[in-house]
Amino acid sequence: FTVTVPKDLYVVEYGSNMTIECKFPVEKQLDLAALIVYWEMEDKNIIQFVHGEEDLKVQHSSYRQRARLLKDQLSLGNAALQITDVKLQDAGVYRCMISYGGADYKRITVKVNAPYRKINQRISVDPATSEHELICQAEGYPEAEVIWTNSDHQPVSGKRSVTTSRTEGMLLNVTSSLRVNATANDVFYCTFWRSQPGQNHTAELIIPELPATHPPQNRTHWVLLGSILLFLIVVSTVLLFLRKQVRMLDVEKCGVEDTSSKNRNDTQFEET
């Protein structure tokens, strides 16, 4: 009795689904009552399928709702373990253990990759030095090196810094910044570089036309304009008030001939 594995190494992507397989000999029809299949990963129990029944009580909590034995494959002599929504913690050495008359087991290694695909970028300007700060941020795994290049794809000299932190899903959150002297429409590239082929991801950053070359002065213009408007409103309000006071004095000096004329004057004044 021999268990075989079509592949003993799987490289899978974070968040994807994977199916790892162990083959065992089945002659004619499968006798479920004689079959035992276990899948384990290090010290975690994933699948316990004994005499046709799966026991989920002993399944490790990290695989709950994510791991299943593909029962329809058993009659073909294939103990296939499917894991959905692959996590970084799923990387490791798996063991399929099968007893069907005789018994045997094999090991399968799983590696998990998370490409730095979604690169967030930002450009800002230092008003004091007119230097541009270019920032690229992305999440992935394992560690990546961030390489900055210009439009000719040549390395860029400038002050750079990198910060790395962990996300909730244990991915690496890598932020790289570069300070350079640049002019409008200059093109820069940040590349999250990993040694494996096909694992490099690049973002293009273009220095904007008028990223308001003097943003603080621009803000001053608005403040000044606002102040002038406010001053004009205050002055016109004061003038109106003074005009009202002058009219009131005139009415008092002339005297009032009858009630109706006084009422008329009041009405006119209110409408002014």
């Epitope: 009795f1 021999t2 035992i36 276990y38 384990e40 010290d43 975690k44 129990n45 316990q48 026991d55 002993v58 490790h60 253990m97 007893s99 069907y100 008359g101 005789g102 018994a103 045997d104 087991y105």
Partner: antibody
Framework: EVQLQESGPSLVKPSQTLSLTCSVT????????WNWIRKFPGNKLEYMGY???????YYNPSLKSRFSITRDTSKNQYFLQLNSVTTEDTATYYC????????????WGQGTLVTVSA | DIVMSQSPSSLAVSVGEKVPLSCKSS????????????LAWYQQKPGQSPKLLIY???TRESGVPDRFTGSGSGTDFTLTISSVKAEDLAVYYC?????????FGSGTKLEIK
């Protein structure tokens, strides 16, 4: 050195549940495979099943669904529970361990004789 | 289940004698991964628990005297005690760990004349 020690009642009434404890020293039950084996009068040895380091279990189909093994990793103990016992279950019960899935029993307890009688 | 048959069921021998104990399995115990047979021999002395003597049909467990030798492959196995000592009085069991459930032979009781 790994040592295993069985404990539990020596007399059980028919139809009752037999419960035995195996206390392990010198090794952690979170590694290896931890088994129960019994020897009937007349020297016949029967393999009952195991609980593994992951907590997975295997039970000999001959015991149908009467038998279960559980563990308490904090106390480094594992347990046998055999329901609805009959006089046929009178035997010396051994706990034993092996290191890998397909390896022989390297360590044995000294055994405890359990008699099922009214 | 794999059936293990042992013969003879009991044997009386004199000290210093060479003794072969036989064990047969109902199917081959040859394990493909290492091309060895998944068979063990145990010794159980009166009032004691079984003790592992031989595994993989011929590998002697550490601390076991070299007068105990295991041989055979596939379905036929032999435990040979080259020169019996009085302390070898015991029941000897063979056991397969080729497939679950593991099974034992009925044992051979060795008595000293």
């Amino acid at each position: 050195e790994v040592q295993l020690q069985e404990s539990g009642p020596s007399l059980v009434k028919p139809s009752q549940t037999l419960s035995l404890t195996c206390s392990v020293t010198g090794d952690s039950i979170t590694s290896g495979y931890w088994n129960w084996i019994r020897k009937f009068p007349g020297n016949k040895l029967e393999y009952m099943g195991y609980i593994s380091y992951t907590g997975s279990t295997y039970y000999n189909p001959s015991l149908k669904s009467r038998f279960s093994i559980t563990r308490d990793t904090s106390k480094n103990q594992y347990f046998l529970q055999l329901n609805s016992v009959t006089t046929e279950d009178t035997a010396t019960y051994y706990c034993a361990s092996y290191e890998g899935w397909l390896l022989p029993f390297a360590y044995w307890g000294q055994g405890t004789l359990v008699t099922v009688s009214a | 289940d794999i059936v293990m048959s042992q013969s003879p069921s009991s044997l009386a021998v004199s000290v210093g004698e060479k003794v072969p104990l036989s064990c047969k399995s109902s199917q081959s115990l040859l394990y493909s991964s290492n091309q060895k047979s998944s068979l063990a021999w145990y010794q159980q002395k009166p009032g004691q628990s079984p003790k592992l003597l031989i595994y993989w049909a011929s590998t002697r467990e550490s601390g076991v005297p070299d007068r105990f030798t295991g041989s055979g492959s596939g379905t036929d196995f032999t435990l040979t005690i080259s020169s019996v000592k009085a302390e070898d009085l015991a029941v000897y069991y063979c056991q397969q760990y080729y497939g679950y459930p593991f099974t034992f032979g009925s044992g051979t009781k060795l008595e000293i004349k």
